[in-house]
């Protein structure tokens, strides 16, 4: 959601005022922020604090293990994507506080929101990659034993980042700053100019590749994983079920508003009442999607405590146990109970 006609995440619309107070500048922005914007600011603040600290801790824990542990590679990449996204939050926060004025210049308008998108999609696609890995661990253990190496994991991560970059290119290319209103306010957004079809195409691709496809992958992967693990009684089913439900539900819940409003706005006439309503909710939808950037460290901690009862362990130690245990066992034909438990813990990142 980042076009001028549906000005996002960083650019609002201002209430029409056709009556003028001639003694003061005609500022289309009231002094008070809208309720959705205030909620967005609260969410951004919480996500920034939890996300930066939590993901920095995850990066620190996994970075040392990434050379020898494949799961550490997954979680390192995921944490880096989330961490970078969180670093951009103060900029969004500042913009909303200033009633969606963009004081950071043209270059920042092109780079920063695009960087945010890059990291958001990198996160989603990395989650899909991890899900595929989970699937292979359960259904192709011999293949995993033979071919599942750090090199392949890094290649998979590179593909995920590359695809995320491709998804971000349209936003970067068409992003411009412009000034409007009295007193003038700088807005930052995507300008597809006269090409409505291109705008819709970008929105559809974003919905399909950035949401529907990963969601479908997750659902199918975890359905099969659950069926297999239950049938072999290899793990504590209720806890595994809770983990999988939490993973899929959090992904679906936090991204759904952003994606649905984005696709609706690309098809709606900008002057329609529905469009204007969605535009007012835009910052809130973006902030809601941003919860994804801080939720993973929380899940890791909960997983570490819930599955292993590591309440007395230090946070880095707890995270290390959750994030860096290897899932592939040396025996080629079966999983041990501890391995599947470990896998269940790790799937909570998704």
């Amino acid at each position: 959601m980042d076009s001028f006609n549906y000005t996002t995440p960083d650019y609002g619309h201002y209430d029409d005022k056709d009556t003028l107070d001639l003694n003061t500048p005609v500022d289309k922005t009231s002094n008070t922020l809208r309720v959705p914007d205030i909620l967005a600011l609260v969410i951004f603040a919480v996500v920034f604090l939890v996300g930066v600290l939590g993901n920095a801790l995850v990066v620190w824990v996994t970075a040392f293990e990434a050379k020898r542990t494949i799961n550490a590679i997954w979680f390192l990449n995921l944490a880096v994507a989330d961490f970078l996204s969180c670093l951009a939050l103060p900029i969004l926060f500042t913009s909303i506080v200033q009633h969606h004025h963009w004081p950071f210049g043209g270059a920042a308008c092109s780079i920063l929101p695009s960087l945010i998108l890059l990291n958001m999609y990198a996160s989603i696609l990395l989650l899909a990659t991890i899900s595929a890995d989970r699937f292979l661990l359960v259904f192709k253990p011999i293949w995993c034993q033979n071919f599942r190496g750090a090199g392949l994991a890094w290649i998979a991560c590179a593909v995920a980042w590359g695809l995320a970059l491709l998804l971000t290119i349209p936003s970067f290319l068409y992003r411009v700053v412009r000034e409007e209103y009295f007193p003038p306010k700088v807005l930052c957004g995507v300008d597809y100019s006269h090409d409505k079809r291109r705008e819709r195409a970008v929105a559809i691709v974003r919905l399909v590749l950035g949401f529907l496809w990963p969601l479908l992958t997750l659902t199918i992967c975890y359905t099969f994983i659950l069926l297999r693990t239950w049938s072999r009684r290899a793990t504590r089913s209720t806890k595994t079920l809770k983990v999988v439900v939490a993973v899929v539900a959090s992904f679906f819940i936090f991204w759904l508003p952003y994606q649905v409003t984005g696709i609706m706005m690309s098809f709606l006439e900008p002057s329609s009442p529905t469009f204007l309503l969605l535009k007012k909710l835009d910052s809130l939808c973006v902030s809601f999607a941003y919860i994804n950037c801080c939720i993973n460290p929380i899940i890791y901690v909960v997983a570490g405590q819930g599955f292993q009862g590591r309440l007395r362990k230090s946070l880095p130690s707890l995270l290390r146990n959750v994030l860096t245990e290897e899932s592939v066992v040396r025996e080629s034909k079966s999983f041990t109970r501890s391995t599947v438990d470990t896998m269940a813990q790790k799937t909570q990142a998704v």
Partner: antibody
Framework: QVQLKQSGPGLVQPSQSLSITCTVS????????VHWVRQSPGKGLEWLGV???????DYNAAFISRLSISKDNSKSQVFFKMNSLQADDTAIYYC????????????WGQGTSVTVSS | DIVMSQSPSSLAVSAGEKVTMSCKSS????????????LAWYQQKPGQSPKLLIY???TRESGVPDRFTGSGSGTDFTLTISSVQTEDLAVYYC????????FGAGTTLELK
């Protein structure tokens, strides 16, 4: 390329209303605002009002009671309507695009010459 | 309303001469939010639509010859033509866009 083409009547009866359509090409009305400016014979430029990309409007206080600006984004058209015209409303009426920066009018229509006379 | 005052109202010049015209506003056009001055200069030749020359008080519009220079801040602004060409003979308007829009009365540039 960017163009603004104006269409409207050349002659208007006193107390009647004036309607001018500004049809734009080369840019989208969802991304740019459009201003209306007039120039009376032998006089300077006078700003009348603007419709912003989001659809909100601002008017010159002297015309607020009888001026209306609207648009149709899908048809790339901006509509200007002024009521209760008098002889001193005789002027050339321009539509102009609000540029990306500085709230400056970077492209102008060719102008519509309007005479108010019975 | 912000009132814009231009001086002189007309100016007789010879080709190659340096020309300076002034524009004053009744209140500051400097935005504390963007740190820009919302003053623009336009050129209008007889029978033509106005043409944007300068915005933000000193930023030349693309395609405008570099002999045109805008300067000033707050309430006092100047348009300078370093070496007048015959095609520069026109009426020059300043315009504020900080609080609504107001044009100056114009400065007519004519041949001596």
């Amino acid at each position: 390329q960017v163009q603004l083409k104006q269409s409207g009547p050349g002659l208007v009866q006193p107390s009647q209303s004036l309607s001018i359509t500004c049809t734009v090409s080369g840019f989208s009305l969802t991304s740019y605002g459009v201003h209306w400016v007039r120039q009376s014979p032998g006089k300077g430029l006078e700003w009348l009002g603007v419709i912003w990309s989001g659809g909100s409007t601002d008017y010159n206080a002297a015309f607020i009671s009888r001026l209306s600006i609207s648009k149709d984004n899908s048809k790339s058209q901006v509509f200007f309507k002024m009521n209760s015209l008098q002889a001193d409303d005789t002027a050339i009426y321009y539509c102009a695009r609000n540029g990306l920066l500085g709230n400056a009018m970077d492209y102008w229509g060719q102008g519509t010459s309007v005479t108010v006379s019975s | 309303d912000i009132v814009m005052s231009q001086s002189p109202s007309s100016l007789a010049v010879s080709a190659g001469e340096k020309v300076t015209m002034s524009c004053k506003s009744s209140q500051s056009l400097l935005s504390s939010r963007t740190r820009k001055n919302y003053l623009a200069w336009y050129q209008q030749k007889p029978g033509q639509s106005p043409k944007l020359l300068i915005y933000w008080a000193s930023t030349r519009e693309s395609g405008v010859p570099d002999r045109f220079t805008g300067s000033g801040s707050g309430t006092d602004f100047t348009l300078t033509i370093s070496s007048v060409q015959t095609e520069d003979l026109a009426v020059y308007y300043c315009k504020q866009s900080y609080n609504l829009l107001t044009f100056g009365a114009g400065t007519t540039l004519e041949l001596k």
